[in-house]
Interface confidence: medium
């Protein structure tokens, strides 16, 4: 497994990581630690593991957190009620 | 090729349960979520849920929550929507349409063929 | 939940001819410069087809007479030569936030 660095799918990250886009080249895509509390993310990125290709910067919300909305268009990973 | 069968029609009282399966064949059944979506004679399309088919997590619309379970048998690779407390307004052909698995897009790129519910007394 | 609007609910055009379809969403579907639009068509007696996802990517198959434009809340299918097995139903559907919601659809006929 590639544990930082470029990757194509979940499969290739460690634990506690998955396949995102890049911040800085959106064609490259790059191990990324799931949400921690407090983190931004984007409330449809949940699926864990994804077997197909991420089209966001951000990771599902570690186990025990959720992705919700604190602001019209500001989500961040906050633990389930 | 890709194919989702789904159960035949049904036609059943208000206030009783329905169970809808779709059998997924042509692929990896657990790389792929499952939607299920309806739609009224001669209207348009209602999105009513999908599921992981590799750990069963699902996500409901919250017009349907309580009143929907959407299940999958990996050892059969079929998808089950069971909709309960049915009324008139439930009457719908009702589809089975697999998750393109385009990141998060949320696609459906294969559907099945519909299964007729009818609701009435 | 996200209102999606067509417009308009029914359109008839000659063979050959050009079929613009728009949407609008009562909200962005946006985010991170990625739209999060599909576009669908049912023809009579059959499941819908998946023709467009995010916005502007064709599907794997379909015509490339088929396009999809726009971002934000605005939206727009277009049939650059309308043939007469595009007759149909089609949907715009967002899937930026649950539920995801279907447009009324616009029926394409021919004139």
């Known amino acids: 497994a590639v544990i930082t660095g470029a990757c194509d799918k979940d499969s290739q990250c460690g634990g506690g990581m998955c396949c995102a886009v890049s911040i800085w080249v959106k064609s490259i895509r790059i191990c990324t630690p799931m949400g921690k509390l407090g983190d931004s993310c984007h409330p449809l990125t949940r699926k864990v593991p994804f077997f197909g290709r991420r089209m966001h910067h951000t990771c599902p919300c570690l186990p025990g957190l959720a992705c919700l909305r604190t602001s019209f268009n500001r989500f961040i990973c906050l633990a389930q009620k | 090729e890709v194919q989702l069968v789904q159960s035949g029609a049904e036609v059943k009282k208000p206030g009783a349960s329905v169970k809808v399966s779709c059998k997924a064949s042509g692929y990896s059944f657990t790389d792929y979520d499952m939607h299920w979506v309806r739609q009224a004679p001669g209207q348009g399309l209602e999105w009513i849920g999908y599921i992981s088919c590799y750990n069963g997590a699902t996500t409901y619309n919250q017009k349907f929550k309580g009143r929907v379970t959407i299940t999958v048998d990996k050892s059969t690779s079929t998808a089950y929507l069971e909709l309960s407390s049915l009324r008139s307004e439930d009457t719908a052909v009702y589809y089975c349409?697999?998750?393109?698995?385009?990141?998060?897009?949320?696609?459906?790129?294969?559907w099945g063929q519909g299964t007729l519910v009818t609701v009435s007394s | 939940d996200i209102v999606m609007t067509q417009s308009p609910d029914s359109l008839a055009v000659s063979l050959g001819e050009r079929a613009t379809i728009n949407c609008k969403a009562s909200q962005s579907v946006d985010y991170d410069g990625d739209s999060y639009m599909n576009w669908y068509q049912q023809k009579p007696g059959q499941p819908p087809k998946l023709l467009i996802y995010a916005a502007s990517n064709l599907e794997s198959g379909v015509p490339d007479r088929f396009s999809g434009s726009g971002s934000g809340t605005d939206f727009t299918l277009t049939i650059s030569s309308l043939q007469a097995e595009d007759v149909a139903v089609y949907y715009c559907?967002?899937?930026?936030?649950?539920?995801?919601?279907f447009g009324q659809g616009t029926k394409v006929e021919i004139k």
């Open positions: 349409a697999r998750d393109s698995n385009y990141g998060e897009a949320y696609a459906m790129d294969y």
């Open positions: 559907q967002q899937i930026n936030e649950d539920p995801f919601t």
